[in-house]
């Protein structure tokens, strides 16, 4: 057992059937010596009385908030969660797989630039009694700062029958110099609450390794003379990481129509500008990647042909 | 400790191609060693990620962007001194401060081309023959380190007494390689940017 | 199996036309660029120009400009390369390919020798 | 136009042994370079489009590498039926223009 925050604990347990539990020891926080009764939840009835009430923790039903009573009045509360082991593993019931970029990816995060600023984000189909808590720090050992805030929803999927919430957290590391060289990986540590049930995430990245810039902006095509070629420029976008002659992209820029199937131009550039050839209902298409180092390519820009 | 704006005129900075010649040779390599070697901890997650150039050079800090020097972080520079002469400056206004920056990169250069030679002679030897040095990468650090043409003593190559470990070996050439290919990203952002200056 | 199916070889006098025929299968026609490629004997390949079947769009080379015309036929799936005031350099095996990406060939002709001699 | 420049001209190689072709353009063209494979009297065939990137059908021994000006095909260990000749191309800007070629032949 051990405490996640004030007055909150969680209790390991291995996960099967006829499992001999954890014997949990809770002590009441007052001066107070005898007259003391316990109750767990909305229950009036006592489970026992005296200055510490020792437990058996097996299942759901021993968890849950146990309250420690004298003459009507409550002098301290324990909330106890389960966090499940079965077969070694700890239990990932909460979160979705996002299976992407491979199986047991619960956490995903980005970086638009190098300025040591992140974003997270993780799936879940749970609506209600949910609660998470994020930390991270640059390296476990000996962790440098890394300043977390709350996770909110973002967004809101169906997915067949099922609803899908989609929660996200943004994260600074405190100190970060955009042309430094990391050898120590970001961590990123995200508990998860669900009714009484505990478990954790984790993540571990380099920010050079989650890098997708934004679209590149101000897409601009400029019809050439006597031919079907058209001159599309655009520029590097504003979030992306300054001196841009050190930190330079490169870009593909592509002709489609609305298929995916359908035939297309395509060509990759350093600089911001291309030549391409434009068709009738087709759109002119960049996105952006770091020139040295092959992280995620951006989202698309478009602009349609005509 | 930062590149100042007054560097060579555009199009007179040799050292550009080699830089991008360098990054291209480190991927390819560093992708063959994770495909030849995929029974081994070859990725960025399984390896520590070690410098051999921490506490020697300090190519991050004397390369620094002007940009870049307001931000206190990145700041936290170690002194080092450097030899000052080299082909790539191009310029009779360059300054100190680039000189500094390109000898750095020299020392990189030099120290990793004394550990890939110790390494390759090691790997020749293994029974297995299950990897070496690409030698297109080993001339591709020679040419850029010519090209740069800064006069520094010669790193003797380490030669080893005892019967080579080559589990060992061959996971320290993934780290090594990892590490270089992260330095070679370094020295092709301020080779793009004293271009463009 | 996609396929292009060439015409057969032609011997041609200078000053004359030519017209090279490429069949395809496999695949919609008009899903596809085509491209005229040609190859002088012993020499490299050099590219003529593009059609988009769809709807008839062309590019040509400037050195052919003027010289040679793609056209399509969606109705047997056919393309068609014409070259014009032909002289004895423009002896060559010309090869017609495509793909759904406009500036490379995934599928090739097995080409047509045109020879030009008085 | 761009100018595309193949080297060597003539590769001899020993069955099993690798191969590398090298492929230079006169002017940058970032990763647009395409390699083919002919054959006498055969169709061409793709085997690496935009530097790097495999074909699907294309065995594994051939890859290709390169950006900017400077482009590498590499045969990793030459199988009898690789014996042909090799072409890059540009796909950069028109008009689409190819090297001269590379001969491999037997040693």
């Known amino acids: 057992i051990w405490e996640l925050k004030k007055d909150v604990y969680v209790v390991e347990l291995d996960w099967y059937p006829d499992a001999p539990g954890e014997m949990v020891v809770l002590t009441c926080d007052t001066p107070e010596e005898d007259g003391i009764t316990w109750t767990l939840d909305q229950s009036s009835e006592v489970l026992g009385s005296g200055k510490t009430l020792t437990i058996q923790v097996k299942e759901f039903g021993d968890a849950g908030q146990y309250t420690c009573h004298k003459g009507g009045e409550v002098l301290s509360h324990s909330l106890l969660l389960l966090h499940k082991k079965e077969d070694g593993i700890w239990s990932t019931d909460i979160l979705k797989d996002q299976k992407e970029p491979k199986n047991k990816t619960f956490l995903r995060c980005e970086a638009k630039n190098y300025s040591g600023r992140f974003t997270c984000w993780w799936l879940t189909t749970i609506s209600t009694d949910l609660t998470f808590s994020v930390k991270s720090s640059r390296g476990s050992s000996d962790p440098q700062g890394v300043t977390c805030g709350a996770a909110t929803l973002s967004a809101e999927r169906v997915r067949g029958d099922n609803k899908e919430y989609e929660y996200s957290v943004e994260c600074q590391e405190d100190s970060a110099c955009p042309a430094a060289e990391e050898s120590l990986p970001i961590e990123v540590m995200v508990d998860a609450v669900h009714k009484l049930k505990y478990e954790n995430y984790t993540s571990s990245f380099f920010i050079r390794d989650i890098i997708k810039p934004d679209p590149p902006k101000n897409l601009q095509l400029k019809p050439l003379k006597n031919s079907r070629q058209v001159e599309v420029s655009w520029e590097y976008p504003d979030t992306w990481s300054t001196p841009h002659s050190y930190f330079s992209l490169t870009f593909c820029v592509q002709v489609q129509g609305k298929s995916k199937r359908e035939k297309k131009d395509r060509v990759f550039t350093d600089k911001t500008s291309a030549t391409v050839i434009c068709r009738k209902n087709a759109s002119i298409s960049v996105r952006a990647q770091d020139r040295y180092y092959s992280s995620s390519w951006s989202e698309w820009a478009s602009v349609p042909c005509s | 400790r930062n590149l100042p704006v007054a560097t060579p005129d555009p199009g007179m900075f040799p050292c550009l191609h080699h830089s991008q010649n360098l990054l291209r040779a480190v991927s390819n390599m560093l992708q063959k060693a994770r495909q030849t070697l995929e029974f081994y901890p070859c990725t960025s997650e399984e390896i520590d990620h070690e410098d051999i150039t921490k506490d020697k050079t300090s190519t991050v800090e004397a390369c620094l962007p002007l940009e870049l020097t307001k931000n206190e972080s990145c700041l936290n520079s170690r002194e080092t001194s450097f030899i000052t002469n080299g082909s790539c400056l191009a310029s009779r206004k360059t300054s100190f401060m680039m000189a500094l920056c390109l000898s750095s990169i020299y020392e990189d250069l030099k120290m990793y081309q004394v550990e890939f030679k110790t390494m390759n002679a090691k790997l020749l030897m293994d029974p297995k023959r299950q990897i070496f040095l690409d030698q297109n990468m080993l001339a591709v650090i020679d040419e850029l380190m010519q090209a740069l043409n800064f006069n520094s003593e010669t790193v003797p190559q380490k030669s080893s007494l005892e019967e080579p470990d080559f589990y060992k070996t061959k996971i320290k050439l993934c780290i090594l390689l990892h590490a270089f290919r992260i330095r070679a990203v370094t020295i092709d952002r301020v080779m793009s940017y004293l271009n463009a200056s | 199996q996609v396929q292009l199916v060439q015409s057969g070889a032609e011997v041609k006098k200078p000053g004359s036309s030519v017209k090279v025929s490429c069949k395809a299968s496999?695949?919609?026609?008009?899903?596809?660029?085509l491209h005229w490629v040609r190859q002088a004997p012993g020499q490299g390949l050099e590219w003529m120009g593009w059609?988009?079947?769809?709807?008839?769009?062309?590019e040509y080379a400037p050195k052919f400009q003027g010289r040679v015309t793609i056209t399509a036929d969606e109705s047997t799936s056919t393309a068609y390369m014409e070259l014009s005031s032909l002289r004895s350099e423009d002896t060559a095996v010309y090869m017609c390919?495509?793909?759904?990406?406009?500036?490379?060939?995934?599928?090739w002709g097995q080409g047509t020798l045109v020879t030009v001699s008085s | 136009d761009i100018v595309m420049t193949q080297s060597p001209l003539s590769l001899p190689v020993t069955p099993g042994e690798p191969a590398s072709i090298s492929c230079r353009a006169s002017?940058?063209?970032?990763?647009?370079l395409h390699w083919y494979q002919q054959k006498p009297g055969q169709a061409a065939r793709l085997l690496i489009a935009?530097?790097?990137q495999s074909i699907s059908g294309v065995p594994s021994r051939f890859s290709g590498s390169g950006s900017g000006t400077d482009f590498t095909l590499t045969i990793s260990s030459l199988q009898p039926e690789d014996f042909a000749t090799y072409y890059c191309?540009?796909?950069?800007?028109?008009?689409?223009?190819f090297g001269q070629g590379t001969k491999v032949e037997i040693k």
């Open positions: 390919a495509r793909n759904k990406e406009l500036r490379y060939f995934d599928v």
């Open positions: 496999g695949g919609t026609f008009s899903d596809y660029y």
């Open positions: 059609i988009d079947p769809e709807n008839g769009d062309t």
């Open positions: 002017q940058s063209i970032s990763i647009n």
């Open positions: 935009f530097a790097s």
């Open positions: 191309q540009q796909s950069n800007s028109f008009p689409l223009t």
